[in-house]
Interface confidence: medium
């Protein structure tokens, strides 16, 4: 009883691995809310309405010192920084459509502003943010960002932004409807980390009482059983899934989109979290306001074949 | 604290240029932009521009495109304000000031910075 | 732009009483997601300006509760309840809704 066995240790370590995970997660990843661009690439018609789709992902707080600035711009590729330069959307600069609203609200340009350029953005308590683009027209085509501030207090702002292309075509080139692309796998693992962090911070308070009675259990089988038997249980235990979690559907979706089929993206790691500046002491911007709530987007992964949805 | 310390006075010629600096503290200077005001005693605060230091994104008013040029170091954490083509109507007072979105104002304020155009 | 203008330009009085100053706007200041972003700051004698107000009615951290705002679309006020000898200076409205923001040209408030 003195030397522990090769159960014993190897379910202790089990145990502790899955215990500092809940730790970990208890304590909150220091990167606070993403944004995801479900689709990196809009192919629309002349004449077509399209929505173009951001999605906070993460913890998202909806307490009352909470307040989101949300909105929209043009801007060009650059070679270091996408989405530095704020362009007008038709004439409308990002300061025009921007929405500043509480965590626990949705909100909307007004509907005069919609009516005179074609245009709405609107932002629903399930983390969606998206912008309403009517009668496309080839000025219309070029890079769009969506750009979410999270001020806290007075003294913490937290801005990221997401960017995707719209291709307005004419001719008989051009599809009969809006064909959407979707992010690639890796823009994908990238925006997800934050909703892996959440739903790991989830599943450990969930599994900790199942943890231990299993760390405590196992710990008791270990001194009763043979060395063959302990052999066989660590492989049984070394065969173990993670605990999955499932991706919801997004409660809003694009209007306009006709989904073929329902977009599901299984993780397969978790990447080091890279980019700007995700928690910030004070900050003030050039940019917009909005709410969310904590939402794992679906997002698939290119394959080799181009992925594509007709909308 | 939130701090912005501007550069000292300048007395510049005609048509010459200057370059004005504010040095951001107490805060990170990435998360938020600074924008720049001038202040004379005929046309009292106006409102030049700003910039978001982590990208470099500019903003002008339209009254001083071609007269301001605005620029950030991130790794001093300060900002900079170039006049050029000065003439004496350029002579007043420039503050840098941090845009805060939670107000959607001008939040903090430089001590302000004099610029005086004479021959 | 938005022409921002003050009434009175200069408003005497004396410690203790309440003061009360008005900014109207050129066009409304509600923004297309109805929040109006109408702001107040305060510029002591030889000093940058400091936020007071901002979004009609918030009293920016630090500001004491004697200093109000109110009203809505073009024509707001500014009011302090007790005038205190700190409270002097050149008090500025300014907006936000439309670019480029813009400044009203200030009420001096002094002492009568």
């Known amino acids: 009883m003195g030397v522990p066995t090769a159960l014993e240790a190897g379910s202790w370590r089990w145990g502790s691995l899955l215990f500092a995970l809940f730790l970990a997660a208890s304590l909150g990843p220091v990167a606070a809310f993403k944004v995801a661009t479900p689709y990196s690439l809009y192919v629309c018609p002349e004449g077509q309405n399209v929505t173009l789709t951001c999605r906070l992902l993460g913890p998202v707080d909806k307490g009352h010192d909470v307040t989101f600035y949300k909105t929209w711009y043009r801007s060009s590729r650059g070679e270091v920084q996408t989405c530095s330069e704020r362009r007008p959307i038709r004439n409308l600069t990002f300061q025009d459509l921007h929405l500043h609203h509480g965590g626990h609200q949705a909100a909307n340009t007004s509907h005069d502003l919609a009516q005179r350029h074609g245009l709405e953005s609107a932002s629903d308590h399930h983390g969606n943010f998206s912008i309403t683009m009517r009668n496309l027209t080839l000025l219309d085509s070029g890079l769009y960002c969506c750009l979410v501030v999270e001020i806290r207090h007075h003294h913490s702002e937290h801005r990221v932004h997401g960017a995707m292309e719209l291709q307005v075509q004419t001719g008989k080139d051009a599809p009969s409807n809006c064909v959407v692309y979707p992010s690639s796998s890796q823009d994908s693992e990238n925006i997800t980390a934050a909703a892996l962090a959440t739903g790991a911070c989830i599943v450990g308070i969930l599994c900790l009482p199942l943890i231990l009675l299993l760390v405590y259990k196992q710990r008791q089988a270990a001194s009763n059983r043979r060395a063959q038997e302990l052999v066989r249980m660590d492989s049984n235990i070394q065969g173990i899934e993670n605990p999955g979690f499932e991706a919801s559907p997004p409660a809003q979706g694009i209007p306009e989109a006709k989904v073929r089929h329902p977009l599901s993206y299984v993780a397969q790691r978790q990447p080091s979290e890279s980019g700007r500046h995700l928690l910030s002491e004070p900050s003030t911007p050039l940019s917009p306001p909005g709410p969310g709530d904590v939402f794992f987007p679906s997002l698939d992964p290119v394959p080799d074949s181009p992925n594509f949805e007709v909308i | 604290q939130v701090q912005l310390q501007q550069s000292g006075a300048e007395l510049v010629r005609p048509g010459a240029s200057v370059t004005l600096s504010c040095k951001a503290s107490?805060?990170?200077?990435?998360?938020?932009?600074m924008h720049w005001v001038k202040q004379t005693p005929v046309h009292g605060l106006e409102w030049i521009g700003a910039?978001?230091?982590?990208?470099?994104?500019?903003a002008y008013n339209q009254k001083f495109k071609g007269k301001a040029t605005l620029t950030a170091d991130k790794s001093s954490s300060t900002a900079y304000m170039e006049l050029r083509s000065l003439t004496s109507e350029d002579s007043a007072v420039y503050y840098c000031?941090?845009?805060?979105?939670?107000?959607?104002?001008?939040?903090?304020w430089g001590q302000g910075t004099s610029v005086t155009v004479s021959s | 732009d938005v022409v921002m203008t003050h009434t009175p330009l200069s408003l005497p009085v004396s410690l203790g009483d309440q003061a009360s100053i008005s900014c109207r706007s050129s066009q409304s200041l509600v923004h297309n997601n109805g929040n109006t972003y109408l702001h107040w700051y305060l510029q002591k004698p030889g000093q940058s300006p400091k936020l007071l107000i901002y979004k009609v009615s918030n009293r920016f951290s630090g500001v004491p509760d004697r200093f109000s705002g109110s009203g809505s679309g073009t024509d707001f006020t500014l009011k302090i309840s007790r005038v205190e000898a700190e409270d002097l200076g050149l008090y500025f409205c300014s907006q936000s809704t439309h670019v480029p923001w813009t400044f009203g040209g200030g009420t001096k408030l002094e002492i009568k």
């Open positions: 910039i978001d230091p982590e990208t470099g994104g500019t």
């Open positions: 000031t941090r845009w805060s979105l939670r107000p959607y104002a001008m939040d903090y």
């Open positions: 107490g805060y990170t200077f990435t998360d938020y932009e």
